[in-house]
Amino acid sequence: SLLPVPYTEAASLSTGSTVTIKGRPLACFLNEPYLQVDFHTEMKEESDIVFHFQVCFGRRVVMNSREYGAWKQQVESKNMPFQDGQEFELSISVLPDKYQVMVNGQSSYTFDHRIKPEAVKMVQVWRDISLTKFNVSYLKR
Amino acid sequence: SLLPVPYTEAASLSTGSTVTIKGRPLACFLNEPYLQVDFHTEMKEESDIVFHFQVCFGRRVVMNSREYGAWKQQVESKNMPFQDGQEFELSISVLPDKYQVMVNGQSSYTFDHRIKPEAVKMVQVWRDISLTKFNVSYLKR
């Protein structure tokens, strides 16, 4: 069954945590649907964003952070492992120095930490997708 | 009650027709939600687009056409009559020479016809909005 979109969940992250998302684009790639995943510093959607991950399906991925309300240096990738019309599984793993983004089991993007992942309090998944799975796995201490 | 998004409806347009849309952005303007309205030449979403109207709330509006699969010259406006968090009523009227876009009763954008409005067969409303009303009014002959 489908999860509501935008989908918002409280989360605490640290090295070893993984966020897993399963979904499907709502439109063909010709129409450039988007997927966005934002790791926020507060439960409010206006809060700062530790890690912003935005896919323009079929075109590009941009990653960034929003600090004190201002977007910082955008990192762009043309790597496009997503398939038109197909379900995707996205997993974002917190490594000591960066986020590693896997698409369908394949390492596709990395983003060096700018803000400590421990600052994350909420994850939001939204834009032009249907969402079937959202999970945060925590490292067993 | 809410209409599904993306929302697709068969439509025939000509001078005097008006498309009316009521909805609300799904996120605060800081997060740049989008609204898109596309007038297609076929019932298929991959078809050409006679009039493409895309709002990046709080930032800008772009208008364009997609002809034989290729986007043409984009028209951009910084005019932003939409209000953060507020419901909007959008009406797109077919004039003899152009589309006139009204936002909350106020004339806000125009787009000169590139393709005859009679070529339109379907309207799609999508992206980051909740939709409460969609109506196409036809001129009484």
Partner: antibody
Framework: QLQVVESGGGLVQTGGSLTLSCTTS????????MIWVRQAPGKGLEWVSS????????YYADSVKGRFTISRDNSENTLYLQMNSLKSEDTAVYYC????????????WGKGTLVTVSS | SSALTQPSAVSVSLGQTARITCQGA??????GIWYQQKPGQAPVQVIY???NRPSGIPERFSGSSSGGTATLTISGAQAEDEADYYC??????????FGGGTHLTVL
Amino acid sequence: QLQVVESGGGLVQTGGSLTLSCTTSGFTFSRYWMIWVRQAPGKGLEWVSSIYNDGGNTYYADSVKGRFTISRDNSENTLYLQMNSLKSEDTAVYYCAKLKAAYYGMDYWGKGTLVTVSS
Amino acid sequence: SSALTQPSAVSVSLGQTARITCQGANLGRYYGIWYQQKPGQAPVQVIYGDSNRPSGIPERFSGSSSGGTATLTISGAQAEDEADYYCQSYESSTSPVFGGGTHLTVL
């Protein structure tokens, strides 16, 4: 091996201008942020300016904003700092440093070049 | 005045443990980095990402961070560790900021 060498320092009058250069080797220059940091005589370190890998984004400390311009030539592996309207408080050793990302900090520094602004 | 506050001086007996603290509201959010600077020389990074040691830095150097405080610990201080130590963090990830520096004396 990795090298970062500053040059262009010297004595300049108040209100004058100077351009510092930082030549680098031993790493892929275009992949890294580059930073200017200064140290006034007997004082601590002060960040001056940063420039992104492709030169598209630049950042400045309030104390130099509008007077200093950071730039880079990735084909020459060189960083620059154009300093205008110099003041006596700009007197310092100017260091060039490389930075991969915020997490890593400034991992390599040059030996510095001394700028003296006299009235 | 710096956004990061360090003690101006710390002294330690040879072979003992020295701790240098760095306080700043942003240290809960941004990483702490530590540099060692000897007279007439450029700074050398000794800790990055709160607690990581670059290659070539002796194991006696360690770092930690909790809340708004970053700490540099030198376990078994040696004579050659006498130097100025600077903490660095960020006002935002594009604006580095330094502490005022701490002079470590090894007695």
